[in-house]
Amino acid sequence: AFGISGVQKYTRALHDSSITGISPITEYLASLSTYNDQSITFALEDESYEIYVEDLKKDEKKDKVLLSYYESQHPSNESGDGVDGKMLMVTLSPTKDFWLHANNKEHSVELHKCEKPLPDQAFFVLHNMHSNCVSFECKTDPGVFIGVKDNHLALIKVDSSENLCTENILFKLSET
């Protein structure tokens, strides 16, 4: 993961560019952990990045991701209480030029070096779940969420709204 000074340069570069025709409205750094407080970490191996879900040793520093928030250009088609806000999508980048990417064919979550504009597979609809947890739904495959399977991130199909709070698709964001 990159240091703060690198992030500031990177953030500025992102703001200066237009991604899928839009720029992020907000960006900040956060660490990502599971509902059970395991950390999501990123390691460079053989010139590609691997994603791990693991318990960190005491005092071990958490990896940070740059969360970039984008307003959907289309109003949500959900019925409800007349909400007039625009749906938010996020991209997650643990290091410069690499973004989390949904591979729907393999049901996997991968880190890809992406050219701008970013592909739709890099965008996730953000959901607020219980206990200050969030979930990430694939823009390209509604009903499919980033989840934890066998100590790795995977894509998990959620069949009904009752299953939205299943622990393996719940994540915590922490800025500390």
Epitope: Y28, L29, G80, D81, M87, L126
Partner: nanobody, 121 residues
Framework: QVQLVESGGGLVQPGGSLRLSCAAS????????MGWHRQAPGKQRELVAV???????NYADSVKGRFTISRDNTKNTVYLQMNSLRAEDTAVYYC???????????????WGQGTLVTVSS
Amino acid sequence: QVQLVESGGGLVQPGGSLRLSCAASGSIRTVNYMGWHRQAPGKQRELVAVVTSGGGTNYADSVKGRFTISRDNTKNTVYLQMNSLRAEDTAVYYCNAAASTYSSTVVRSFWGQGTLVTVSS
């Protein structure tokens, strides 16, 4: 429906200070972040500062060391303390919040109407 109401804008001399407030109300379930953007005449809207529910902050380079963002989570209110104001800070300041409502888990972006800050002698 989620409403954001800003206050605190006005005319101030260069070097002066102002404090903006923004209160969110409505059927709010969870707020992910609250922040301030600004738009000067003839320019694009730009991020000024953001504070997350966990207290993390991010500032535009042009305001670092002069502006401070803070948030009262219990009141769903965000504040922007602006010190050492310059003429180039003149803009309409908009409050922005990312939140979900009781009717949906989906996080949405909401905007206030804006408050004008004019820095001039």
